[in-house]
């Protein structure tokens, strides 16, 4: 008889992750007797993947009947591929003996698997910043295979390009993670913005993955304040308005103060919001002149999602306002203006980062 | 290593059934066929038949067809041989043999069951 | 069925002798270039002992004094210097379709 061969007649199998594999193999004599086992690698750390003749191998079945008359088949289905089971699996024939002994084996067929990428996870920085300022956004993605992967960054539909990538591990893995880091600059306009991670991978078909996460948990917009004052009312009583605009978020206290001590403190909430994300606030204070011998000095005071306390003054002159009537008003309105505000917000900012 | 290990010795009343078992170890019993084959005293082999555990699928000797039954449970890898409305001409010892290499060949026996038909 | 005869029923050799035992089939036994041809060796008080598979080649743990030849039909199991371990009966045995075995060959030391 001809010299027993086993034949493994593919090098090389890729699947999908989650699929079957198949993995042929055929001898070409039925001498001498003796079963077949199927091992991934090769010498000593070798590892069984299936046995003819001894086992549970409960991902294993064998594609022909081991049990089949003069079976020279030798092929097995491996069910439920991982990325796990990436490597080159080795068809060897044994000689029956006490115990069997090992007589040939095939030239080994290497199982790559496909694996999908998980969903993109997009995480942006861990405090707040304001406009100007650059934030950045990671993208991480795992378990993908094989290695090549396209990573984009968007930016409200606009592609951005200030973003580095890593994928790990650089040698041969049974599968890879990805991850990005996008540098975003932030405007006043972007409460409502997003950016968008998008993943390319050979196993998703030409339909990308992607990861989003709304500027709105990264950004702060600092409010303008102004402090106007109503016309005198007939009681003698003078109506302060403070008007904050423009602000993100919501998170904002409003404290009045008469000649520097609190009349009032209040919390913001349930504001509707401006087409562009951002609240406005109107808070009013009315100021008994008659109970004022000197010059009221107002003061509004917001602390706006945390931040140090801005102040806007307005001084309300006792001696322009005769007792028993109320027409002209002369007041001054003291304190730092807007772009001052902006000013002090950003060296805040700069003094945290 | 594979081993075959049969039940004990019986003694049947002609017209009874007997049913001998075959415990088998140190192999993946539902890959491989087992046979069953007798020998009467000072007799020569007569094979009777042969199931496959995976299935049960089995081949009967025309002789035994319509009084042997094989069966197998899984479970304890054991297979099962029936034999009924004995005879003292069954009076034999019974063997179970294992196929090694699906060529319907017999490469580890169990050790027999004597199986003794008499009034 | 295919009935295998064997020849001779008993036979004597002495020590060192060869001993021939020979199986006919009463069909070919041969397909797809095998001949499913077994033979057997039993001692008194044991069960069969597999020597030889496919006609003609030697099962794990068999003496090479054993060998066994034929195609088709006939078939033959040699040993080339009997020891007295080999007295014993043979039995040959096909798997063409369902096995049958020969009625055995009963081998004596001369």
């Known amino acids: 008889e001809e010299e027993l061969q086993v034949i493994q007649p593919e090098k090389s199998v890729s699947v999908a992750a989650g699929e079957s594999a198949t993995l042929n193999c055929t001898a070409t004599s039925l001498i001498p007797v003796g079963p077949i086992q199927w091992f991934r690698g090769v010498g000593p750390g070798r590892e069984l993947i299936y046995s003819q003749k001894e086992g549970h191998f409960p991902r294993v079945t064998p594609v022909s009947d081991p049990t089949k008359r003069n079976n020279m088949d030798f092929s097995i289905r491996i069910s439920n591929i991982t990325p796990a089971d990436a490597g080159t699996y080795y068809c060897v024939k044994f000689r029956k003996g006490s115990p069997d002994v090992e007589l040939k084996s095939g030239a080994g067929t290497e199982l790559s698997v496909r694996a999908k990428p998980s969903a993109p996870v997009v995480s942006g920085p861990a405090v707040r910043a304001t406009a100007e300022h650059t934030v950045s956004f990671t993208c991480e993605s795992h378990g993908f295979s094989p290695r090549d992967i396209t990573l984009k960054w968007f930016k409200n539909g606009n592609e951005l390009s200030d973003f580095q990538t890593n994928v790990d591990p650089a040698g041969k893995s049974v599968s890879y993670s990805i991850r990005s880091t996008a540098r975003v600059v932030l405007t006043r306009r972007d409460v409502h913005s997003q950016v968008i991670c998008e993943v390319a991978h050979v196993t998703l078909q030409g339909d990308p993955l992607r990861g989003t996460a709304n500027l709105s948990e990264a950004i702060r917009v600092p409010p303008f304040l102004e402090v106007t004052q109503q016309s005198m009312r007939a009681d003698n009583q003078v109506n302060v308005t403070c008007q904050v605009t423009k602000f993100y978020p919501q998170r904002l206290q409003l404290t009045w103060l008469e000649n520097g001590n609190v009349s009032r403190t209040e919390m913001a909430s349930a504001l509707p919001e401006n087409k562009d994300g951002t609240y406005n606030w109107t808070s009013w204070l009315l100021v008994n002149v008659s109970a004022h011998r000197d010059d009221v000095k107002l003061t509004c005071q917001v602390e706006h999602d945390g931040q140090p306390a801005v102040n806007k003054s307005f001084s309300v002159k006792v001696s322009a306002h005769p007792k028993e009537q109320g027409s002209n008003t002369a007041a001054e309105n003291t304190g730092t203006n807007e772009r001052d505000y902006k000013d002090d917000d950003d060296k805040h900012h700069h003094h945290h980062h | 290593q594979v081993q075959l290990v049969q039940s004990g010795a019986e003694v049947k009343k002609p017209g009874a059934s007997v049913k001998v078992s075959c415990k088998a170890s140190g192999y993946t019993f539902t890959n491989y066929w087992i046979n069953w084959v007798r020998q009467a005293p000072g007799q020569g082999l007569e094979w009777i038949a042969m199931?496959?555990?995976?299935?049960?699928?089995?081949h009967y000797n025309q002789i035994f067809k319509d009084r042997a039954t094989l069966t197998t449970d899984t479970s304890t890898s054991t297979a099962y041989m029936e034999l009924r409305s004995l005879r003292s001409d069954d009076t034999a010892v019974y063997y179970c043999?294992?196929?090694?290499?699906?060529?319907?060949?017999?490469?580890?026996w169990g050790r027999g069951t004597l199986v003794t038909v008499s009034s | 069925d295919i009935v295998l005869t064997q020849s001779p029923d008993s036979l004597a050799v002495s020590l060192g002798e060869r001993a021939t035992i020979n199986c006919r089939a009463s069909?070919?036994?041969?397909?797809?270039?095998?001949?499913?041809i077994f033979w057997y060796q039993q001692k008194p008080g044991q069960p069969p002992k597999l020597l030889i598979y496919?006609?003609?080649n030697l099962d794990p743990g068999v003496p090479d004094r054993f060998s066994g030849s034929g195609s088709g039909t006939d078939f033959t199991l040699t040993i080339s210097s009997l020891q007295a371990e080999d007295v014993a009966v043979y039995y040959c045995q096909h798997s063409r379709e369902l096995p049958t075995f020969g009625q055995g060959t009963k081998l004596e030391i001369k």
């Open positions: 496919l006609a003609s």
């Open positions: 043999a294992m196929d090694y290499g699906s060529l319907y060949a017999m490469d580890y």
């Open positions: 069909k070919s036994v041969s397909s797809s270039g095998y001949n499913y």
């Open positions: 199931i496959d555990p995976s299935d049960s699928e089995t």
